[in-house]
């Protein structure tokens, strides 16, 4: 599967999402991620599928990927823990926890995000924020600065229609509308934030972006609370 982009969004306010991480391979942005604890970043399992021979690092405190910023720091990864049930050919259990080489230096631009522990669906229509450094248009342009977009949550029944994702959306997944505004290539692993709480992680499945009949798919973190807690313990 591809690395999941912010399509139809806009540049984010600099450092207003201090939980935002860029998972990097050999010094280049690969996927999004979200700081969930001082020493742990949550991302998508498929992001590391092709990273066997490369150096994986995590960039925190960044707005621009290329420009120097006082809050920016690149961390080595001590341990990568994909969900044990994640598989290359499915979107299920597409979660990855990355343990940083040391605790992140926290500040206004680097701060963990509270994540949802109550295993209950987000109400359809709820506006949630997704951010990332993924491609920003159909040409495939990659932005230097963090982009974001607000997307309404889509009910599972609609998302599972034959014309949409045809039953692939389990109770451990959620959908958001994708009509011209969407997450996509390069955004996988990034956060879907509703009401200031992490609710979902952008999946890495093969999907056309910006097509309303192919809604964005997000892994529900609340459904994996036990696993996250067990790894972070």
């Amino acid at each position: 599967p591809p690395r999941g982009r912010i399509l139809g969004g806009r540049e984010a306010e600099a450092h207003a999402r201090p939980y935002m991480a860029s998972v990097q391979l050999n010094g280049a942005h690969l996927c999004g991620g979200v700081l969930v604890a001082e020493q742990w970043v949550l991302s998508a399992a498929h992001c590391l599928e092709d990273a066997a021979d490369g150096k994986v690092q995590v960039l925190l405190g960044a707005h621009s990927l290329s420009q120097p910023e006082p809050s920016k720091r690149l961390y080595d990864v001590l341990r990568a823990v994909p969900h044990p049930d994640s598989q290359p050919d499915t979107i299920d259990h597409d979660l990855l926890l990355l343990q940083l080489s040391e605790k992140a230096t926290l500040g206004p631009a680097v701060r963990p995000l509270p994540w949802q522990r109550v295993d209950r669906d987000v109400a359809p229509g709820t506006l949630c924020d997704v951010a990332g450094w993924g491609i920003v248009n159909h040409a495939g342009r990659r932005p230097d600065s963090l982009q974001h977009v607000l997307l309404p949550v889509l009910d599972r029944a609609t998302c599972n229609r034959r014309t949409h994702h045809d039953g692939a959306i389990t109770e451990r997944l959620m959908c958001a509308e994708s009509n011209r505004r969407d997450s996509c290539k390069g955004d996988s692993g990034g956060p879907l934030v509703c009401g200031g709480v992490l609710e979902g992680v952008v999946t890495s499945g093969s999907r056309v972006c910006g097509n309303r009949k192919k809604p964005g798919i997000y892994t529900r973190v609340a459904s994996y609370a036990a696993w996250i807690d067990s790894v972070l313990a």
């Epitope: 599967p1 491609i135 248009n137 159909h138 040409a139 290539k185």
Partner: antibody, heavy 113, light 106 residues
Framework: EVQLQQSVAELVRPGASVKLSCSAS????????MHWVNQRPEQGLEWIGR????????KYAPNFQGKATITADTSSNTAYLQLSNLTSEDTAIYYC??????WGQGTSVTVSS | QIVLTQSPAIMSASPGEKVTMTCSAS?????MYWYQQKPGSSPRLLIY???NLASGVPVRFSGSGSGTSYSLTISRMEAEDAATYYC?????????FGGGTKLEIK
């Protein structure tokens, strides 16, 4: 340094097929989109289609549906354009481009009997 | 599909002169690109997303517009700017090019 090296000029017979290559260096094609654009003699630019090399998903302009097939080999970091059932109308220069920001030098295809 | 009409088809300008060419879309767009192509060369990206300068492009080039009307401006024409310029929209599939404006040096 980003570079796109395209295959040499082709002279082909009507009805035949041709496969053009675009070898990329300085970046990983899996991380972007690869597009093909053509330009007929003394004409403007025409978008043919694109591929997301990470998953093989393609999109074609209606005029090139059934005529063009875009593929990618991520192990060799190369994108391909196959053109089938060629006619004189397909005589053109074919460009590959990475997300429209870096372009290959173009491959001239001449269809003639 | 969205039709992009560029005008004028051909124009000429003297060195140092300000040059403006337009691209009119049959429907509203927001992702407009501009390219420069010199004879015998590949196209070169000049402007992306209406007004952003691509890497290495001189600051005398600028893009503007909204809705269905867009323009490319060269603040001071230089001999090396003689080329054909194409607009392209990235909003609605299929992603279409304009027919081009050929800019000649006087």
């Amino acid at each position: 340094e980003v570079q796109l090296q395209q295959s040499v000029a082709e002279l082909v017979r009507p009805g035949a097929s041709v496969k053009l290559s675009c070898s990329a260096s300085g970046f990983n094609i899996k991380n972007t989109y690869m597009h093909w654009v053509n330009q007929r003699p003394e004409q403007g630019l025409e978008w043919i289609g694109r591929i997301d090399p990470a998953n093989g998903i393609t999109k074609y302009a209606p005029n090139f549906q059934g005529k063009a097939t875009i593929t990618a080999d991520t192990s060799s970091n190369t994108a391909y354009l196959q053109l089938s059932n060629l006619t004189s109308e397909d005589t053109a220069i074919y460009y590959c481009t990475r997300a429209m920001d870096y372009w290959g030098q173009g491959t001239s295809v001449t269809v003639s009997s | 599909q969205i039709v992009l009409t560029q005008s004028p088809a051909i124009m000429s300008a003297s060195p140092g002169e300000k040059v403006t060419m337009t691209c009119s879309a049959s429907s509203s767009v927001s992702y407009m690109y501009w390219y420069q192509q010199k004879p015998g060369s590949s196209p070169r990206l000049l402007i992306y997303d209406i007004s952003n300068l691509a890497s290495g492009v001189p600051v005398r080039f600028s893009g503007s517009g909204s809705g269905t009307s867009y323009s490319l401006t060269i603040s001071r024409m230089e001999a090396e700017d003689a080329a054909t310029y194409y607009c392209q929209q990235w909003d609605t599939y299929p992603w279409t090019f304009g027919g081009g404006t050929k800019l000649e040096i006087k």
